[in-house]
């Protein structure tokens, strides 16, 4: 019996079609993605073959204003129009808070959403009961199969999902759940989910009864054979694991931004036992139109988007210096906000002895594209920040060690004076330049806000330790030089949408005067 | 309230082309699909395109591609059609019509006359 | 591409009189992602812009008389107006609202017996 499955994973709100590299379409002959894209390859599919499954891996929520002026109503409607049959969640379903996923998402999905590892307790599991499951069973053709979710379980360091949600550990929470499939007399089971390729592959190790898992979180990209577009693959689609009771368990993900549809051909024999499985993921290119009634959708629902876009999110009293003869150069206040809403957004109270997970921002001079004039009556709006911040990037949660971090600051000033994008600005930590010393060998004082503390102070860097910072996605793979950070990451966890997380905080604080306030220095 | 003007009636030669405008006002112009339709006389109503003017972004139908170009100036909140290598085919009222969240054509220009005479 | 073929062609009735009127697409207009049918309704007058009277099928525009109903899923809706009153002599269309190309039918003429 021969099951094909059709993954997506880390959509992010990805729903018009994007550039390549998923940023918004600026040439429309060249871009890619998109729901109406997608929807135009799925149906093709199950034209074409008798027994096709559509699964999400967890992460629609959160990425562009698609997200922020519809908060998921747009991810009911267009996953339930494209007729996803299951969906895991992700840490970022739960970043406008459990009530931000229930009323959009959970109530108005005509999908099951799935996750074995949250227990609600107290009383939302009264609330929440039914509305997401553990696992659920689908009749595919003549057959059936189970399909049960996961999450990771750093979400509460990753989201607001409140105090009333337990996140266990994946494999401990899915064994039970599998073993009950089991006794349905269910034979052919998949784990979808969405704690990153790295425990994909332990659940496929690890969780008796797993014939396949499907995956997300870490933004995978696998490929057999020559890669269509410019991602490198991490491995083989899909990636072979030997479990620890001598099967081989076929392990997916494909990669992001519904930028391509995971494809999955598993034969199964009667016993359910997995005979082959091959395939690849389908990069959804411009060779494939896009399907007219979802496009007309799009459409509808686009309009909303450029009306918010314009509107006041809150002001500023103060010139915003987002100038590259500041930011390249020294601290700007353009630059201390960004990275203040940044720490602000990533604020979790989850433990006693810290007072946050997290206090420490970077962020490369060259990604601030643009100051904000105060004397527009102090207006600040979503299209002034989409100036600022036009790349459509994500802010990140990284753990890195303080030697890491000495060479992400000596790098940040190792060409100074060149006007080049990697000085970095900070939040959460003081830093000292002597320029009149060699490159490599500038940063004469680092300083770092603890965590660890009732009363947040300023402490010499320690090199062994290990320090969680918040930083754009695009220093996290390396870029502007910053090789060191992406070859020494102990973890990286993928954050919001870098313009969301700056109009929030705007929005919150109503009325904002960042200065410049001593955080670099120069000796 | 949302008002669409329409330039006024055009008599213009075989072969020739002809620019028509749609100005916008009452409403955030750069916001809302407008769409173009043609009726010629005492006949149905005939899609022709759309056009986002936030970002230019353009749908055709089919039967229109390279005979309609559609163009949106932001800074005069004025959409613009142009009809080229015009026959006696073309003769008809052109209108505009913005669309909004429930329907793609609540709100309607006044429709444009285009005559195609030697 | 849609079609939409509209019955009967013209319509003579008189002053508070009921009238149906057609309108059958090629293809479903259901909408799965809000289970409303993506169907509108418009009213043409000599020398005037068509007029939206009913969107998602059953939905009356604004300001439209309660006369005016609009029924019917699928492929197959009914334009009806329960009493007829002189202004409501025109030519009545419907729309495909559901994708590309917008297509439109082929009318109704509503005369005067």
């Known amino acids: 019996w021969e099951l094909t499955i059709l993954h997506t994973n880390d959509v992010h709100s990805r729903l018009e079609q994007t550039s390549e590299d998923s940023s918004k379409c600026v040439n429309a002959s060249r871009c890619m993605g998109g729901v109406a894209r997608l929807f135009t390859k799925v149906q093709q599919i199950r034209r074409a073959e008798p027994n096709v499954l559509l699964l999400d891996a967890g992460d629609q929520y959160q990425g562009t204003i698609w997200f922020t002026v519809y908060k998921g109503a747009e991810v009911a409607h267009f996953m339930n129009a494209l007729r996803y049959d299951a969906m895991a969640l992700g840490n970022h379903e739960f970043d406008n808070g459990v009530e931000g996923l229930i009323e959009p998402l959970l109530k108005e999905a005509k999908f099951p959403i799935l996750s074995a590892n949250i227990k609600a307790k107290g009383p939302l599991a009264s609330q929440i009961s039914g509305l997401y499951l553990p696992y659920k069973v689908l009749p595919v053709g003549d057959e059936v199969v189970g399909i049960v979710g996961y999450t990771s379980k750093e979400t509460p360091f990753l989201s607001n999902p409140g105090t009333n949600l337990v996140f266990e550990d994946e494999i401990t929470a899915l064994q039970p759940e599998v073993d009950k499939l089991k006794t349905l007399n269910v034979n052919k089971i998949i784990a979808l989910g969405h704690s990153g390729f790295e425990m994909d592959k332990l659940i496929a190790q690890k969780v008796r009864g797993v014939d396949v898992v499907v995956g997300g979180h870490s933004n995978t990209f696998l490929y057999t054979g020559n890669p269509p577009s410019k991602e490198v693959p991490a491995g083989k689609y899909p990636f072979i694991v030997t479990s620890d009771d001598g099967r081989k368990v076929p392990v997916v993900q494909a990669y992001a931004f519904g930028k391509y549809l995971g494809y999955l051909k598993i034969e199964f024999d009667e016993r359910g036992n997995v005979i082959s499985s091959h395939g690849n993921p389908i990069l959804l290119n411009s060779s494939i139109p896009e399907d007219p009634s979802i496009k007309a959708d799009i459409n509808k629902w686009r309009i909303k988007l450029d009306n918010y876009s314009t509107q006041e999110l809150g002001k500023t009293i103060v010139y915003l210096d987002g100038s590259s003869q500041s930011c390249r150069f020294r601290e700007c206040n353009m630059g201390n906000l960004i990275c203040d809403a940044m720490i602000n957004n990533n604020l979790r109270h989850t433990d006693e002895m810290f007072w946050n997970h997290v206090s420490m921002c970077i962020l490369n001079g060259g990604g601030i594209r643009s100051p904000i004039d105060e004397r527009n009556n102090g207006t600040i709006t979503w299209e002034n920040l989409a100036a600022v911040l036009p790349f459509g990037g994500t802010f990140d949660l990284v753990q890195l060690k303080g030697s890491t971090l000495k060479k992400a600051f000596e790098h940040s000033v190792h060409r100074y004076g060149q006007s080049t994008g990697e000085f970095l600005q900070v939040g959460g930590i003081h830093v000292v330049y002597d320029l009149s010393r060699k490159p490599g060998d500038r940063v004469v004082k680092l300083d770092v806000l603890c965590t660890k503390c009732r009363v947040p102070s300023y402490d010499p860097l320690k090199m062994d330790e290990v320090y969680k910072v918040i930083l754009p996605n695009f220093l996290a793979n390396g870029g502007d030089g910053f090789q060191m950070i992406k070859d020494e990451l102990l973890r990286h966890d993928s954050g919001d949408q870098d313009i969301n997380v700056v109009s929030t905080y705007i929005s919150k604080m109503k009325v904002i005067y960042p200065a410049v306030e001593g955080r670099i220095k120069f000796s | 309230q949302v008002q669409l003007q329409q330039s006024g009636a055009e008599l213009v030669k075989p072969g020739a082309s002809v620019k028509i405008s749609c100005k916008a006002s009452?409403?955030?112009?750069?916001?809302?699909?407008v769409n173009w339709v043609k009726q010629r006389p005492g006949k149905g109503l005939e899609w022709i395109g759309q056009?986002?003017?936030?970002?230019?972004?353009?749908n055709y139908s089919g039967s229109f591609k390279g005979k309609a170009t559609l163009t949106a100036d932001k800074s005069s909140s004025t959409a613009y059609m142009q009809l080229s290598s015009l026959t006696s085919e073309d003769s008809a009222v052109y209108f505009c019509?913005?669309?909004?969240?429930?329907?793609?054509?609540?709100?309607w220009g006044q429709g444009t006359l285009v005559t195609v005479s030697a | 591409d849609i079609v939409m073929t509209q019955s009967p062609s013209s319509l003579s009735v008189s002053a508070g009189e009921k009238v149906t009127m057609s309108c059958k697409s090629s293809?479903?207009?259901?909408?799965?992602?809000?289970?409303?049918?993506?169907l509108a309704w418009f009213q043409q007058k000599p020398g005037q812009p068509p007029k939206l009277l009913i969107y998602?099928?059953?939905t009356r525009e604004s300001g439209v008389p309660d006369r005016f109903t609009g029924s019917g899923s699928g492929t197959d809706f009914t334009l009806t107006i329960s009493s007829v009153q002189a202004e409501d002599l025109a030519v009545y269309y419907c729309?495909?609202?559901?994708?590309?190309?917008?297509?439109f039918g082929t009318g109704t003429k509503l005369e005067l017996k």
């Open positions: 019509a913005r669309m909004d969240f429930y329907s793609w054509f609540p709100y």
């Open positions: 009452g409403y955030a112009f750069r916001s809302y699909w």
């Open positions: 056009i986002f003017p936030g970002d230019g972004d353009i």
């Open positions: 293809q479903s207009l259901l909408n799965s992602g809000n289970q409303k049918n993506d």
């Open positions: 998602g099928a059953s």
């Open positions: 729309q495909n609202d559901h994708s590309y190309p917008l297509t």
